[in-house]
Interface confidence: low
C-alpha cells in the first residue's frame, strides 16, 4: 500500500486511509503505538482502504504502520505519525455565586496539562482571560457585576496543544442595595469584612462617601465615625475641621459632623461606643442617636442606653457641638479650650473621646467617666452608628 494518512483526529479517535496495493491482496495488517501505549495490531480485509482507530490516548504521538499480506507474502511496511488532540476539562460548574463573586470548578482532562485558559464574559461584552496552573481545579472569580449573565469557558493547555473549550453559564445575584446608604445596607449586600466601603447618602449615587464599616461587632453593619487608638492624629482641631472630618479612616479619624447629620437624617440610628484599655473592654449602646444640622450647631440626641461602660452620654444629650474656636457649651469657660478637645460639651463633660490621647490629667484625656473616671485616658475608643432596626433587616435577609 502507499499514501498512508490520518484524518478526523480527535482526542480519542483517528481515521487511517491508504492507497491500496496494485496487486490483489488478502489483507492489510495495521498496527499503532504511542509513548507509554502498548502496540495494537488489527488485520482488515484486502479491499479495505481506511480504518477507524479508537480508544486512543489524548495528547499522544502515535506511530501508525501498515503492510499488505497475500498468502505467505508480506509487502514492505509504510509508516505515518499523528498526534491526538488534547482532551477537554470536564464538568465546568459555577458555584457559590454571589453578587460580585463566583467559584468555578472543573475536572481535569485525562492528558497531562501545563495549564488552563479561563475566559469569562458578561452580556455587555466585557471579557476577561486568566491562565491558571496545571494542578488547579477551581478558580474564584471576583469583581463581577451584580445581576449579570456570565459565560465562563475553559480550555486545557499542553505546550502548543489546546483542547476544545467547554463552557457554563451563570448569573450573579442582584444587590439588595445597589447604592447602600450605610454600612448595614453594605452588609445586607453580602459584604461581611470590616474595612473601607463607599456608601451613598440617601441612596444617591452622586452623594458618595468613603467610610470604615465594622462588620463584626455585635452583628456588624456599623459606620465607624470616631477612632482613637494610638495618639498619632491631632484631635485638637477647629470647627471647620470637625464639620468636614479629618484623619485616616483605617487609623485614627473623625468622620465629620456634616456627614453625621446627613447619615442620621436618613432614618432612626443607634450609637455604639466600644472602649478598650489594658485588656479590659466596655461598650455603650444608645438606641436613638442623631446629629442636627449646622444651624443647630450639630445638636446631639442620644437616648436609650444599654451596655457595660455606664451611661455617660446622657449628660451631653441635647447639647450643641463645641470646638476651641466656636464655643457653644454651657460653661463659663470654653470647654474645648480647657480640655484640649471637642465634643457636645455641657459643663464640661462626662465623655471626652476627642481629648488628648494618653493624658491622664483630670478631664484632659480620652475619658468615659462612668467607666474609667476623669483621670484615666482610655487607650482605644470607637464610636459607630447603624439603623436601629438593623436586627429586623438582618433577620429578614436571612429568611429571604
Amino acid at each position: 500500500p502507499s499514501g498512508l494518512v490520518t484524518a478526523n483526529i480527535t482526542d480519542s479517535e483517528a481515521l487511517a486511509r491508504w492507497q491500496p496495493a496494485i496487486a490483489t491482496v488478502d489483507s492489510y495488517v495495521i498496527s499503532y503505538t504511542g509513548e507509554k501505549v502498548p502496540e495494537i495490531t488489527r488485520t482488515v480485509s484486502g479491499n479495505t482502504v481506511e480504518y477507524a482507530l479508537t480508544d486512543l490516548e489524548p495528547a499522544t504521538e502515535y506511530t501508525l504502520r501498515i503492510f499488505a499480506e497475500k498468502g505467505p507474502q508480506k509487502s514492505s511496511t509504510i509508516t505515518a505519525k499523528f498526534t491526538t488532540d488534547l482532551d477537554s476539562p470536564r464538568d465546568l460548574t459555577a458555584t457559590e455565586v454571589q453578587s460580585e463573586t463566583a467559584l468555578l470548578t472543573w475536572r481535569p482532562p485525562r492528558a497531562s496539562v501545563t495549564g488552563y485558559l479561563l475566559v469569562y464574559e458578561s452580556v455587555d461584552g466585557t471579557v476577561k482571560e486568566v491562565i491558571v496552573g496545571p494542578d488547579t481545579t477551581s478558580y474564584s472569580l471576583a469583581d463581577l457585576s451584580p445581576s449579570t449573565h456570565y459565560t465562563a469557558k475553559i480550555q486545557a493547555l499542553n505546550g502548543p496543544l489546546r483542547s476544545n473549550m467547554i463552557q457554563t453559564i451563570f448569573t450573579t445575584i442582584g444587590l439588595l442595595y445597589p447604592f447602600p446608604k450605610d454600612c448595614s445596607q453594605a452588609m445586607l449586600n453580602g459584604d461581611t469584612t470590616s474595612g473601607l466601603y463607599t456608601i451613598y447618602l440617601n441612596g444617591d449615587k452622586a452623594e458618595a462617601l468613603e467610610v470604615f464599616c465594622d462588620m463584626t461587632s455585635d452583628g456588624g453593619g456599623w459606620i465607624v465615625f470616631l477612632r482613637r487608638k494610638n495618639g498619632r492624629e491631632n484631635f485638637y482641631q477647629n470647627w471647620k475641621a470637625y464639620a468636614a472630618g479629618f484623619g485616616d479612616r483605617r487609623e485614627e479619624f473623625w468622620l465629620g459632623l456634616d456627614n453625621l447629620n446627613k447619615i442620621t437624617a436618613q432614618g432612626q440610628y443607634e450609637l455604639r461606643v466600644d472602649l478598650r484599655d489594658h485588656g479590659e473592654t466596655a461598650f455603650a449602646v444608645y438606641d436613638k442617636f442623631s446629629v442636627g444640622d449646622a444651624k443647630t450647631r450639630y445638636k446631639l440626641k442620644v437616648e436609650g442606653y444599654s451596655g457595660t461602660a455606664g451611661d455617660s452620654m446622657a449628660y451631653h444629650n441635647g447639647r450643641s457641638f463645641s470646638t476651641f474656636d466656636k464655643d457653644t457649651d454651657s460653661a463659663i469657660t470654653n470647654c474645648a479650650l480647657s480640655y484640649k478637645g471637642a465634643f457636645w460639651y455641657r459643663n464640661c463633660h462626662r465623655v471626652n473621646l476627642m481629648g488628648r490621647y494618653g493624658d491622664n490629667n483630670h478631664s484632659q484625656g480620652v475619658n468615659w467617666f462612668h467607666w474609667k473616671g476623669h483621670e484615666h485616658s482610655i487607650q482605644f475608643a470607637e464610636m459607630k452608628l447603624r439603623p436601629s432596626n438593623f436586627r429586623n433587616l438582618e433577620g429578614r435577609r436571612k429568611r429571604a
Epitope: 469584612t193 463584626t216 455585635d218 478598650r276 485588656g279 473592654t281 457595660t308
Partner: antibody, heavy 120, light 107 residues
Amino acid sequence: QVQLVESGGGLVQPGRSLRLSCAASGFTFDDYAMHWVRQAPGKGLEWVSGISGSGGSTYYADSVKGRFTISRDNAKNSLYLQMNSLRAEDTALYYCAKDISAVPDTFDIWGQGTMVTVSS
Amino acid sequence: DIQMTQSPASLPTPVGDRVTITCRASQYIQGFLNWYQQKPGKAPKLLIYDASNLETGVPSRFSGSGSGTDFTLTISSLQPEDFATYYCQQSYSTPQTFGQGTKVDIK
C-alpha cells in the same frame, strides 16, 4: 478569681458525637464572648468557634462549620460545644477561652483543656 | 482567612539574651495582634494585646511592636521561666488565626 473548667472530653469513634462543657466563674459571664480553641497533639493552636456575650452571634472555623455548634447558658455561666460527625483530625486538646470583649477579640483567660480523641 | 506566619520556628537562646520573634499577617490588620505564651502541659497565657499592650501581670521585659502586617515580640533579657512556645494571633477578623508558634528553648 476568674476560672474556666472544661469537661466532656474522651475517646469517641469517627462519625459519633460529643458535647463539651465549660463552667465559668469569677466574672460577669454574659459581658464577654467565649471561645473554643483546640490543639492537636504536638501541634499549634487552632481557633474553633466563638459566641458573643448575649449568645446572639456565633462564629465557626471552616473546618468545623456544619458539624459543631457552640452555645451558652448565661444563667448557668456555662459554655458548650456540640461536636457531631467527628473525624480523626478533630483529635485535640480543647480549650475554653474567655474574650476581653463581648464580641470576638482577644483571649485573656484560658481553661486547662479537655482531651478529645477520635479513633476507631 | 488571614494567614499568620511566624519566624523562626525554633529559637535556642542563652539565659540573659535578647529574643525577637516576628509575625507577618497576610493582609492589613491595623494593630489587632496578640501574643500568647504556652509552656508544656499548660494552657496558653495572654502576654501582649493590640500589638504592643502588656497584659496585666506580665513582666516588663516583654514588649510588642508593629502594625499593619509586620509585628514583633521582644524579650529584652530571657529568663529561665520564659522558655516556652510563643504564638501570635490576629483578632482583626473572624476566624481568628494563630501563627504556627516559635519554640524558645535553652541554648
